[in-house]
Amino acid sequence: ELCDDDPPKITHATFKAVAYKEGTMLNCECKRGFRRIKSGSPYMLCTGNSSHSSWDNQCQCTSSAARNTTKQVTPQPEEQKERKTTEMQSQMQLADQVSLPGHCREPPPWENEATERIYHFVVGQTVYYQCVQGYRALHRGPAESVCKMTHGKTRWTQPQLICTGETEPSQFPGEEEPQASPDGLPESETSR
């Protein structure tokens, strides 16, 4: 069941999921000057069964100058560097090391993808927060949020995190000492 709204926003923090539950949607968003093609789903879907899950549908972006074409535009090398999520490469290397039943890993980037990934999460999904570069984490509890269903309505729990001051960024689960990791190695990220 889809969560009605997005995870809470924490000032000076980003969140990511370790893995995505079946039913999760990832919108096919494109960077400026490009748009998703008109044929095919407007989103990718984490689908499958308890033993194997994968992303269904493929996102494709086309030049928005050519309004009625579905030609894929191959980006120049410098354009491919535009994604702002700098930790993505290291996360993708870790992704192959773990597979949670009924979950999908972070899908690989597509050509001319937008800098921000827009997910529709499902009930039971946990996302983890960390402070952005230059801000220090003050923890009053878990720096995570879970989408829960109560009385037929979905809600996200409030992460117990405040980002303040100037220092190194805090870590997502799996990026610090092993005992600090709640779910094992991270498989994915999203930036807000």
Epitope: D5, D6, S39, G40, S41, P42, S64, H120
Partner: antibody, heavy 114, light 107 residues
């Protein structure tokens, strides 16, 4: 809570135009396409088109090209649809829809009558 | 354009019964199909996305299935509050198109 609040009913003359609004709340307006759907008794639901407030992209169902004009104001998180050269065929309920079809507005009833 | 057909305009059922509403697309739409419920005087409510996934708050007696061109919305243990019109929609290719609707009547 995610909500799409549409403007009130309109009674308009043939040949004129009407502009209705759809105010989004509870989510990031610029992240999601907003679509518009027409419903007439006996004619089911028809997709008019959609707009991406963040990217500025607009797609129209060819049937509604020249009839509908979609715009969005990101500062107020409001999408608009203007219908021009109104005829009795345009009398209908118009819905806005967002968040990958999950959320629908309550609808705006447009009645075209002399 | 992809034509979406709901061949049964009306279906009659009793409380506690199981009923299946069908939908056929004129071309392969994968699983890019949604189902909506519309009660009299209300706007459509999203029930199912991607052919088989329920939206939040939708009772589990509503089940979607199918892929390609043939899709089914099954309501098991029908309740009186299920009295409504049900629409399917394809969003595999533009323009998105809807079925003509199936009105569920409770005996």
């Amino acid at each position: 809570q995610v909500q799409l609040q549409q403007s009130g009913a309109e009674l308009v003359r043939p040949g004129t135009s009407v502009k209705m609004s759809c105010k989004a709340a509870g989510y990031t307006f610029t992240n999601y396409w907003i679509g518009w759907v027409k419903q007439r008794p006996g004619h089911g639901l028809e997709w008019i088109g959609d707009i991406h407030p963040g990217g500025g992209y607009i797609d129209y169902n060819e049937k509604f090209t020249g009839k509908a004009t979609l715009t969005a104001d990101t500062s107020s998180s409001t999408a608009y649809m203007q219908l021009s050269s109104l005829t009795s065929e345009d009398s209908a309920i118009y819905y806005c829809v967002s968040r990958n079809f999950a959320k629908w507005g309550q609808g705006t009833l447009v009645t075209v009558s002399a | 354009d992809t034509t979406v057909t709901q061949s049964q305009k009306f279906m009659s059922t009793s409380v506690g019964d199981r009923v299946s509403v069908t939908c056929k697309a004129s071309q392969n739409v994968g699983t890019n199909v949604a189902w909506y419920q519309q009660k009299p005087g209300q706007s459509p409510k999203a029930l199912i996305y991607s052919a088989s996934y329920r939206y939040s708050g939708v009772p589990d007696r509503f089940t979607g299935s199918g892929s390609g061109t043939d899709f089914t919305l099954t309501i098991s243990n029908v309740q009186s509050e299920d009295l409504a019109e049900y629409f399917c929609q394809q969003y595999n290719s533009y323009p998105y198109t809807f079925g003509g609707g199936t009105k569920l009547e409770i005996k």
